[in-house]
């Protein structure tokens, strides 16, 4: 068990024109909230499927009014972290999806008007008790900047939350066959026994000394097989006189939830309470495996033979982490010589040369750059018995004096639109999609690229999805 | 404006079949969020939820109840029929209907307009 | 079923004071909802989500709480306030209420 947990850091315009119009004004004050969902696995479903992983919504936060005249600023926010509790194993793979909600304080009567201003998701790899990750998500105009992170819930520890820790009942080491609890040290491994007896098949335990029976079994043991034989038919009506109950169609009908777990139904959906080791909407997840496809970057998955993982990644160069998310910061060795500036681009180390410096690690000393000026920071470089100027970003041509156009190579897919910026070039990209150059597809197989329609919203007002 | 008003028999027999029906006005039941639900209160006694419709036809029923009642929605009417089964004496009360929203599956955000109320007797 | 424990049952107090009420889940619930209902009249809502108040309601109603333990005050008691209070959770079918509390002028 544990809490994923999700810190907002700000929520306003992006970079770039076309700044979005404050959503609150003078005349229809509003406060925002957030509504974060998470689901196991690395599938990209569509926004309306259920929060399989759990879900959660944030405070209200503080009423804001919009300043005439004001371009719209970074919003007040509420206070305090997302959390979303967790009842078994951390996946170790997710999906997320950040709703940003506002609710307007009009004097209408009745229930609060809400709508949708920004819906951002994304697909992470995050292995339980690490550091603070912090991301930033663009949806339209909007720019959302957030931290998260997954924690276990003592006595559960290791990057799934799946080992128990116990103090040590001896100072000096732990009982036989148990390690320590890294990184807790005077903790020690609890091994999980279930009561005596205790059929392996049909019973599992989610504290020691209990015997919880898997469907169609009982008794104290789950040894003893549920009968049925009182019941005329498994669909018939419900008799009084035999005492079967059966209901009619629902969506815990026939129990969906396998591995034991127990259904209740929700306002809309189905809920599944899921026995230990298991999670998913279904509890039909008994762990992230290699099936899962859960190493970034190329990394090769081999299973693995320590408890706490079913999978281990090899990561290729220049990649780190459990899962290879990490991109090593190579340039940390400082490969380029003469105070040349390093540059990691992923599939190789460059290094901008300083005036008077060339060679692929800046080795080369060169003197013939003394009298050329190189405009707006740009360095001269000697190669071939000709020198020229290495531009900064963003700029071009012989002496660096023309501004180059980062979007004519036209880098932003599926009809995202480009705009130059101080530090490259960013994409906003078209509805239905995201990413850096808007190559994921928010929705895929077919499903709408479109959230469903807000509540509150009468018939006839307009709905704009951002 | 939201309104929504309950309309039907103020007295039924026992073991008949009361049919009750919401009209509203202010919201759509094709709106994705929305929803309608049926609440009733004995005399005297605390509010008891019976069931409710979605706007794409996900249907709720109190288990208690599940084997007597049926819900429906006719979108284009706004309207939200129930019906409840061989009725008793103990099933007296006010009933309501209300106005639900839903953010998704898994959070009602708010039950936030209500019928005035329709008083059913069930007697002989 | 989720039981939804409400206290006190009835409740006499005076303009001005400073009211609390309770409401126990019998396990744990996302989010709490507060209605409050004058004889003869329909419920009406007070707090949605546990602590979020509805449109028109005045903000000496405020509404707290997590898991299984919620609690409805109100800061200061106005004339217009006496009447039976109700919770109800949203987590689980069937979907409770509680059995009321009755708020009483002393």
């Known amino acids: 068990a544990g809490v994923f947990e999700l810190q907002i850091h700000s929520f306003g315009p992006g970079p770039g024109p076309g700044a979005p119009r404050s959503p609150c004004s003078a005349r229809l004050p509003c406060r925002l909230f957030f509504r974060v969902c998470l689901k196991p696995g690395l599938s990209e479903e569509a926004a309306e499927s259920p929060c399989a992983l759990g879900a959660a919504l944030s405070a209200r936060g503080p009423v804001y009014t919009e300043q005439p005249g004001a371009p719209a600023p970074d919003l007040p926010l509420p206070d305090g972290l997302l959390q979303v509790p967790f009842r078994d194993a951390w996946p170790g793979t997710f999906s997320f999806i950040i709703e940003t909600w506002r609710e307007e304080l009009g004097d209408q009567i009745g229930g609060p008007a809400w709508s949708l201003l920004a819906r951002v998701a994304g697909r992470r790899r995050l292995a339980a008790g690490g550091p603070w990750a912090r991301d930033i998500q663009r949806a339209g105009a909007w720019e959302l900047r957030f931290s998260y992170r997954a924690r276990c819930e003592p006595p559960a520890v290791g990057t799934a939350c799946t080992r128990l820790c116990r103090p040590r009942s001896a100072p000096s080491r732990c009982g036989p066959g148990l390690r320590p609890c890294a990184p807790l040290e005077d903790e020690c491994e609890a091994p999980l026994v279930c009561r005596a007896g205790c059929s392996p098949e049909h019973g599992f335990c989610e504290q020691p000394g209990e015997c919880r029976c898997l469907e169609g079994w009982t008794g104290p043991l789950c040894t003893v097989p549920v009968s049925t034989s009182s019941c005329l038919s498994p669909r018939g009506p419900s008799s009084a006189t035999t005492g079967c109950l059966v209901p009619g169609p629902g969506p815990c009908d026939g129990n969906p939830c396998a591995n034991g777990g127990s259904c209740s139904e929700t306002p809309r959906s189905f809920e599944c309470t899921c026995p230990r080791g298991f999670y998913g909407l279904r509890c039909e997840v008994s762990g992230v495996t290699c099936a899962d496809g859960p190493c970034f970057n190329g990394g090769l998955c081999v299973g693995g033979a320590d408890p706490d993982s079913a999978y281990i990644c090899h990561c290729p160069p220049g990649f780190q982490g459990s899962n290879c998310e990490k991109r090593v910061d190579r340039c940390s060795l400082q490969p380029c010589r003469n105070g040349g500036l390093c540059l990691d681009l992923g599939h190789a180390l460059r290094c901008r040369c300083r005036a008077g410096f060339a060679g692929p690690r800046c080795e080369h000393d060169l003197d013939d750059c003394a009298g050329r000026a190189c405009a707006n920071g740009g360095t001269c470089v000697e190669g071939g018995g000709a020198h020229r100027c290495s531009c900064a970003l963003g700029f071009g041509g012989r002496d660096c004096r023309e501004r180059a156009d980062p979007c004519a190579a036209r880098p932003c897919a599926h009809g995202g639109r480009c705009y130059a910026h101080f530090s490259g070039l960013v994409c906003a990209c078209a509805p239905g999609y995201m990413g850096a150059r808007c190559e994921f597809p928010v929705h895929p197989d077919g499903a709408s690229a479109l959230p469903a329609a807000p509540p509150g919203l009468r018939p006839g007002d307009p709905q704009r999805y951002l | 404006q939201i309104t929504l008003k309950e309309s039907g028999p103020t007295l039924v027999k026992p073991t008949q079949t009361l049919t009750l029906t919401c009209t509203f006005s202010?919201?759509?039941?094709?709106?994705?969020?929305?929803?309608v639900g049926w609440i009733r209160q004995p005399p005297g006694k605390a509010l008891e939820w019976l069931a409710h419709i979605w706007w794409d036809d996900v249907k709720r029923y109190s288990p208690s109840l599940k084997s007597r009642l049926t819900i429906t929605k006719d979108t284009s009417k706004n309207q939200v029929v129930l019906t409840m089964t061989n009725m008793d004496p103990v099933d007296t009360a006010t009933y309501y209907c209300a106005r639900i929203v839903s953010f998704d599956n898994d959070v009602v955000s708010a039950m936030d307009y209500w019928g005035q109320g329709t008083l059913v007797t069930v007697s002989s | 079923d989720i039981q939804m424990t409400q206290s006190p049952s009835s409740l006499s107090a005076s303009v001005g004071d400073r009211v609390t009420i309770t409401c126990s889940a019998s396990s744990h619930v996302s989010y709490m909802y507060w209605y409050q209902q004058k004889p003869g009249k329909a419920p009406k809502l007070l707090i949605y989500?546990?602590?979020n108040l509805a449109s028109g309601v005045p903000s000496r109603f405020s509404g707290s709480g997590s898991g299984t333990d919620f609690t409805l005050t109100i800061s200061s008691l106005q004339p217009e306030d006496f009447a039976t209070y109700y919770c109800q959770q949203w987590r689980s079918n069937p979907f409770t209420f509680g059995q009321g509390t009755k708020l009483e002028i002393k």
């Open positions: 989500l546990t602590s």
């Open positions: 202010g919201f759509s039941l094709s709106t994705s969020g929305m929803g």
